[in-house]
């Protein structure tokens, strides 16, 4: 298990003053309570849910749990110490870690992924750290909508 410590209490995320978030730019117009950054929209929850509940909540907003393209994708919230459920789970059928859309996890994203317990789900910290935890644990979560 990775040795990152989880902080149990942190206020709901608010972007820092130096972060340039997009508001109704050419490629990015996000609904209320969502954050626009680099032509994606993100919903950063303040509630704690199980992984499956989080997945359903994202789906009900026509989005999916966060699928990371690279580790600096969440630069806009790098001040957060919180861990969030993301859309990564182990597929017994494919014997691989898959994102919600079915694509495989790049080994370069989380070099330590081979130590993850395949029965667990993945929680991610915007500084680039990932933890495997029981899917029944409750965490905040991040939903993502790609606009382009």
């Amino acid at each position: 298990k990775n040795s990152f410590t989880k902080l149990s209490i942190e206020p709901a995320f608010t972007p820092g003053p130096n972060i340039e978030l997009q508001k109704d730019s050419d490629c990015c117009s996000c609904q209320e309570k969502w954050v626009g950054y680099r032509c994606n929209c993100y919903f950063i929850s303040s509630e704690q849910k199980t992984w499956n509940e989080s997945r359903h909540l994202c789906a009900s907003q026509k989005s999916s749990l966060l699928q990371l393209q690279n580790t600096d994708e969440l630069d806009f919230m790098s001040s957060s110490q919180q861990f969030y459920w993301i859309g990564l789970s182990y597929s017994e059928e494919h014997t691989a870690w898959l994102w919600e859309n079915g694509s495989a996890l790049s080994q370069y994203l989380f070099p330590s992924f081979e130590t993850f317990n395949t029965k667990n789900c993945i929680a991610y910290n915007p500084n680039g750290n990932a933890l495997d935890e029981s899917c029944e644990d409750k965490n905040r979560y991040i939903c993502k909508q790609q606009l382009i």
Partner: antibody, heavy 121, light 113 residues
């Protein structure tokens, strides 16, 4: 719990205001819907409103005639029915979205018992 | 709008036997970003409001007996009652919540043979 009221007999072209009193959950946290069912027929979704009340959608069949609204201070959902037609005769149900306020792509986990609206001369 | 078509319109099944209801959508209700099917099943008994049975095509609502199951993906879905009980006599509806307007199938009436 959801309890509808306000149904009744109304003439074509008339108006009616339905209400749905909610209890047992944090009303403002959930989008709410109206669904209707004509006698002996299937279910037809009518309208949805976000938890805050600032976003609404409705079916083409009622657009411009029906207006959904809510009063979160009173835990009450409303449906204003104007320019009523015979084909609007139905039991009107209010139904709670399963997920949160801004989630419109939802199934309904709680329904009221319904209130009957009859449009006839 | 997405049109939901259910078959058959009615179904008579012996007690303890399997009942199968089909639902077809005019376009896919599978969202590629999360591979989830935006489809629910409801049961409605006479004089009562509908009652949620299944959501996300195959997730059983809590409290619903495990003889009810949902399957399918994309445009073709099935509700199965593995062993019909007397209390299962009702009309069953599928609903898509992939896009607004939300739409329901026409219903399937299940009776005892």
């Amino acid at each position: 719990q959801l309890v509808e009221s306000g149904g009744g007999l109304v003439q074509p072209g008339g108006s009616l205001r339905l209400a749905c009193a909610a209890s047992g959950f944090t009303f403002s946290n959930y989008a709410m819907n109206w669904v209707r069912q004509a006698p002996g027929k299937g279910l037809e979704w009518v309208s949805v409103i976000s938890g805050s009340g600032d976003t609404t959608y409705c079916a083409d069949s009622v657009k411009g005639r029906f207006t959904i609204s809510r009063d979160n201070s009173k835990n009450t959902l409303h449906l204003q029915l104007n320019s009523l037609r015979a084909e609007d005769t139905a039991v009107y149900y209010c139904a709670k979205n399963c997920y949160g306020s801004g989630s419109y792509y939802n199934h309904f986990d709680y329904w009221g018992q319904g209130t009957l609206v009859t449009v006839s001369s | 709008e997405i049109v939901m078509t259910q078959s058959p319109d009615s179904l008579a099944v012996s007690l303890g036997e399997r009942a199968t209801i089909n639902c077809k959508s005019s376009q896919s209700v599978l969202y590629s970003s999360n591979r989830m099917n935006y489809l629910a099943w409801y049961q409605q008994k006479p004089g009562q409001p509908p009652n949620l049975l299944i959501y996300w095509a195959s997730t059983r609502e809590s409290g619903v007996p495990d003889r009810f199951s949902g399957s399918g993906s994309g445009t073709d879905f099935t509700l199965t009652i593995s062993s019909l009980q007397a209390e299962d006599v009702a009309v069953y509806y599928c609903q898509q919540y992939y896009s607004i307007p939300l739409t329901f199938g026409g219903g399937t009436k299940v009776e005892i043979k």
